[in-house]
């Protein structure tokens, strides 16, 4: 039987959720007037880039959209983007699609996502509402790299 992605709402410690704005992901306060994305998460079957200390390798997509999170270098800086791609198309590939891969690590009750293409760069939200979700190598005060995966199904 083919695997199915797991579905989660994603939230940070300041109760910010991920929201789709056009073809970008932004962080916005948890609110009745805001529709948070449902994150699709599925493990990569290929073990080529695996590193158990960093976590499980996963693909991340947006439920209901053919959009997946993707890392690319823009002007010399690792950048988080959304690319038109069905998460199951990535999953069925025999070879790991490195730019779409993230190490998913658990830290207590929170989840951390590190780019496989750019080790040391983590998915983050800033302290300001309405800002894009981005990649950072600075974990700490000025941004948030720890997320709660809330079951929505």
């Amino acid at each position: 039987r083919e695997a199915a992605p797991k579905s989660y709402a994603i939230r940070d410690s300041r109760q910010m959720v991920w929201v789709l704005s056009g073809n970008s992901l932004i962080a916005a306060p948890l609110s009745r007037s805001i529709k948070p994305v449902t994150l699709h998460l599925i493990a990569c079957r290929d073990t080529e880039f695996s590193d158990k200390e960093k976590g499980n390798m996963v693909y991340l997509g947006i439920k209901g959209k053919d959009l997946c999170l993707f890392c690319a270098e823009i002007q010399g800086k690792p950048t988080l983007q959304l690319k038109e791609k069905n998460i199951m198309d990535l999953y069925v590939e025999k070879k790991a699609q490195k730019p779409f891969l993230f190490f998913h690590n658990k830290e207590g009750s929170t989840s951390v996502f590190q780019s496989v293409s750019y080790p040391g760069w983590f998915i983050a939200t800033s302290t300001t509402s309405g800002q894009p979700i981005f990649l950072t190598k600075e974990r700490g005060i000025t941004n948030n790299t720890n997320f709660y995966l809330d079951s929505v199904e």
């Epitope: 410690s13 306060p29 929170t110 809330d150």
Partner: antibody
Framework: ELQLQESGPGLVKPSETLSLTCTVS??????????WGWIRQPPGKGLEWIGS???????YYEPSLKSRVTISVDTSKNQFSLKLSSVTAADTAVYYC??????????????WGQGTLVTVSS | ESVLTQPPSVSGAPGQRVTISCTGS?????????VHWYQQLPGTAPKLLIY???NRPSGVPDRFSGSKSGTSASLAITGLQAEDEADYYC???????????FGGGTKLTVL
């Protein structure tokens, strides 16, 4: 239907630790996306949030009380509890437990216990 | 001093309309966190009256309505009745405190 019931001593001596328990019925304390809070109301005054714990076990405390407060969950008894150390007369209040769901009440509290009066006095 | 500011008291005659304001800041209401309103009748626990700025839980009469704009919110009560005499509290979330915040409460007197 979810119901909450506070319990604990009504009288606590100054400098001691106030301990209260909130028993949850009609639902599981580990149910996804729920948060559980403690709110107090000094006599004749307004509501003051003390702290919360959610289904992940994450705790959040009012900054001015953080050094004295501990909130924990006992899943086997379907309860959550409040401990407030080094109490003074200023901690005399009616203590309420309350709950909400991140994706249904959006950081509001839709179910409350009836409250329990705690007096700090020697 | 409460993080959210409410008038200490308001009053109105039966049948009238009254409003209660709730003023916050850029780290709570102004940051687009929702505002919730509670009614506390004398000697009882608070009851959720409005959630998510303008939504009534089932059983709450449509005489009660909420709104929000910028860093402020308000609760309106139309067709005032004697049983509306109570304390009313607004509540939101504040990201700078990583916690829930309440207004100081407003005592509604029905004349």
């Amino acid at each position: 239907e979810l119901q909450l019931q506070e319990s604990g001593p009504g009288l606590v001596k100054p400098s001691e630790t106030l301990s209260l328990t909130c028993t949850v019925s009609g639902g599981s304390i580990t149910a996804s996306n729920y948060y559980w809070g403690w709110i107090r109301q000094p006599p004749g005054k307004g509501l003051e949030w003390i702290g919360s714990i959610d289904y992940t076990g994450s705790t959040y405390y009012e900054p001015s009380l953080k050094s004295r407060v501990t909130i924990s969950v006992d899943t086997s008894k379907n309860q959550f509890s409040l401990k407030l150390s080094s109490v003074t007369a200023a901690d005399t209040a009616v203590y309420y437990c309350a709950t909400g769901n991140y994706y249904e009440t959006y950081l509001g509290f839709d179910v409350w216990g009836q409250g329990t009066l705690v007096t700090v006095s020697s | 001093e409460s993080v959210l500011t409410q008038p200490p008291s308001v009053s109105g005659a039966p049948g009238q309309r009254v409003t209660i304001s709730c003023t916050g800041s850029s780290s709570n209401i102004g940051a687009h966190y929702d505002v919730h309103w509670y009614q506390q009748l004398p000697g009882t626990a608070p009851k959720l009256l409005i959630y998510g700025n303008d939504n009534r839980p089932s059983g709450v009469p449509d005489r009660f309505s909420g709104s929000k704009s910028g860093t402020s919110a308000s609760l309106a009560i139309t067709g005032l009745q004697a049983e509306d005499e109570a304390d009313y509290y607004c509540q939101s979330y504040d990201y700078s405190l990583s916690g829930y915040v309440f207004g100081g409460g407003t005592k509604l007197t029905v004349l």
